[in-house]
Amino acid sequence: EVEKTACPSGKKAREIDESLIFYKKWELEACVDAALLATQMDRVNAIPFTYEQLDVLKHKLDELYPQGYPESVIQHLGYLFLKMSPEDIRKWNVTSLETLKALLEVNKGHEMSPQVATLIDRFVKGRGQLDKDTLDTLTAFYPGYLCSLSPEELSSVPPSSIWAVRPQDLDTCDPRQLDVLYPKARLAFQNMNGSEYFVKIQSFLGGAPTEDLKALSQQNVSMDLATFMKLRTDAVLPLTVAEVQKLLGPHVEGLKAEERHRPVRDWILRQRQDDLDTLGLGLQGGIPNGYLVLDLSMQEALS
């Protein structure tokens, strides 16, 4: 707590300006009117106040707004935002995307601070869902934001928001997260034509089922090996050699380099060696000619 002392004659602040950096803490407390500070918050950021001086300014705002700051003040907090505690932020009602952006800018390039984590939580809960503009903003500052949500949380993301997702935003997602995001992406991009659709859906294909991969194989998409290697093993296994050849197009030659890795390894084991030989890549490990293939999973389902 800063002691209440009278403001020395002639030192009463008429506006928030550089002269205040020479004020002692007690002088700031005594000579700066909280209401003036609130209306001129946008100036605080341009003035090189010390951390101690910022503490005093925060204290003044806390006294003026014990129930939480109004958004007009929050939007201009700048570096004073880093002085806020999560408890302070929980009192706020931030509804403007511009306010969110302004505060995220303060922390840009750094790991998420407790303040930012609380702010984002409050903002998203206030909106009710992760809409496109919010997701766009969050991933601009935190590219891994989407992949930091659980599959359950991702299920409440509306398909329209998927338009805001860039390939790098999915880099750290695990297969279960992609399982949830893929159907949303499929719905979001359904009205696009073949080649445009493939460009957009490509990053999400780690969640695609077999039927969709079969459909893509009919569209001359020329999937690259990096994308193929991220597909679900269970979705790749039922594909025929002809379908994989069509799916990969000129990239099919890359299968040789990946023959020991999933899902290629497991897929090879399911194919007839005769069929594999038609690729002319020297892939080995397929089912020898004359062997009968029993689908045990089908047998179990029937019994």
Epitope: E111, M112, Y142, G144, S148, S150, E152, E153, T172, D174
Partner: nanobody
């Protein structure tokens, strides 16, 4: 800066169990996803399991029902309980911490399952 240190690997007979630990040091806030990956000799690194900020979990098909991921927030540690181990589970197991901005990796711990 976040650092991750795995432990608990070793040699075990097929059918046996192991419990891997991953201790995180350094501060991170916001949503955190802890994941285990593994990499067998000459193979690509593959995802094993995840535990999300909400506490919910998910597993890859090969380990579903045999492995359990859990965490102790007080100790900043995530665990992977591995039961009914198979020779195919032999690999270096890596711990990964994903935040909204970064992805951090541990050095890995070797798990060998003999038949």
């Amino acid at each position: 800066q976040v650092q991750l240190v795995e432990s608990g690997g070793g040699l075990v007979q097929a059918g046996g169990s192991l419990r891997l630990s991953c201790a995180a040091s350094g501060s991170t806030f916001g949503r955190i996803v802890m994941r285990w990956y593994r990499q067998a000799q000459g193979k690509q690194r593959e995802w094993v399991a995840s535990i999300y900020d909400s506490g919910s979990t998910s597993y890859s098909d090969p380990v579903q029902g045999r492995f359990t991921i859990s965490r102790d927030n007080a100790r900043n540690t995530v665990y992977l309980q591995m039961n009914s181990l198979r020779p195919a589970d032999t690999a270096v197991y890596y711990c990964n911490l994903g935040t909204a901005l970064s992805s951090y990796w541990g050095q890995g711990t070797q798990v060998t399952v003999s038949s």
